[in-house]
Amino acid sequence: MAVTACQGLGFVVSLIGIAGIIAATCMDQWSTQDLYNNPVTAVFNYQGLWRSCVRESSGFTECRGYFTLLGLPAMLQAVRALMIVGIVLGAIGLLVSIFALKCIRIGSMEDSAKANMTLTSGIMFIVSGLCAIAGVSVFANMLVTNFWMSTANMYTGMGGMVQTVQTRYTFGAALFVGWVAGGLTLIGGVMMCIACRGLAPEETNYKAVSYHASGHSVAYKPGGFKASTGFGSNTKNKKIYDGGARTEDEVQSYPSKHDYV
């Protein structure tokens, strides 16, 4: 029950996380114009991974995509790549995890197969979350570097007011969405990996058997060994096959002609 809950919760958390990563990747507000110590303007600038926007004080907004691919900064391309890889891995992970869910029966899929699929999806979610966190962090680092570079290039403007030569940009909403989403995907992945351990079937418990050799009056029962060593924790001894060897319980329940002289 706990395994099913852990797996289900891991799936839901990862699903929310990946939805967040997609949302962050599509959002325009990765960097927003820093309004602190800025000359009062009627316009506000903000940029995303795919386009840049200008918003008027009236609310009217105009956006333009980055049409050139070669002219874009390498860092921006790297962030785009990390986010896309994160989305793709997350989407594949979700697909795999749907079939791995314990509450869903697909044909005669064994628990070992479900455990493997759960582990695979968990690893995919972890990598997906890490990609998103890395992408957002690289972009944030780029913003911080540019912010302090523009701050260093200051000049004294009219009225003795200190101004920057370039407009400074600060963290946009997409960065926070990306960090949270990446974290959720990562947590979901860890939960899936934990659930996998519970799904994996334990090693086969070999039943204690009585070997009956005709002509001998004493049956060899290795039950004492089982009890003393702690092996064979399985209490439900099921009848596996009929033959010369029988389970301990069977021998005790059904005496044979070899048991007594």
Partner: nanobody
Framework: QVQLVESGGGLVQPGGSLRLSCAAS????????MGWFRQAPGKGLEFVAG????????DYADSVKGRFTIARDNAKNTLYLQMNSLRAEDAAVYYC????????????????WGQGTQVTVSS
């Protein structure tokens, strides 16, 4: 990279009008935010007006608001600045500038610049 050439400057009387043009060499003119800056003798660069890619948003310095109008014709790859009710303090070298992603009043944000055109306001 885009090359910008200004024209239309000259001598004008106070209260007069003048229309500046800025021709861009690049056919990707529509993918640039454009701006006009001016520099009076012994002064720094001052933002005059700016316009977004398709001309939907325009920004003006308080000193020129209501007197100057910025416009662009993407089909002709040309930027315009219509200057009315000119004053003596409007006399300066006017520069056309371009940048790809932001409409700002800071000269450091503009990557491409023209050589400038002189505007003299005198009676």
């Amino acid at each position: 990279q885009v090359q910008l050439v200004e024209s239309g400057g000259g001598l004008v009387q106070p209260g007069g009008s003048l229309r500046l043009s800025c021709a861009a060499s690049d056919s990707t003119f529509s993918s640039y935010i454009m701006g006009w800056f001016r520099q009076a003798p012994g002064k720094g660069l001052e933002f005059v007006a700016g316009i977004t890619w398709s001309g939907g948003i325009k920004d003006y310095a308080d000193s020129v608001k209501g007197r100057f109008t910025i416009a662009r014709d993407n089909a002709k790859n040309t930027l315009y600045l219509q200057m009315n009710s000119l004053r003596a303090e409007d006399a300066a070298v006017y520069y056309c500038a371009a940048n790809a992603i932001q409409l700002t009043r800071r000269s450091g944000d503009y990557a491409y610049w023209g050589q400038g055109t002189q505007v003299t306001v005198s009676s």
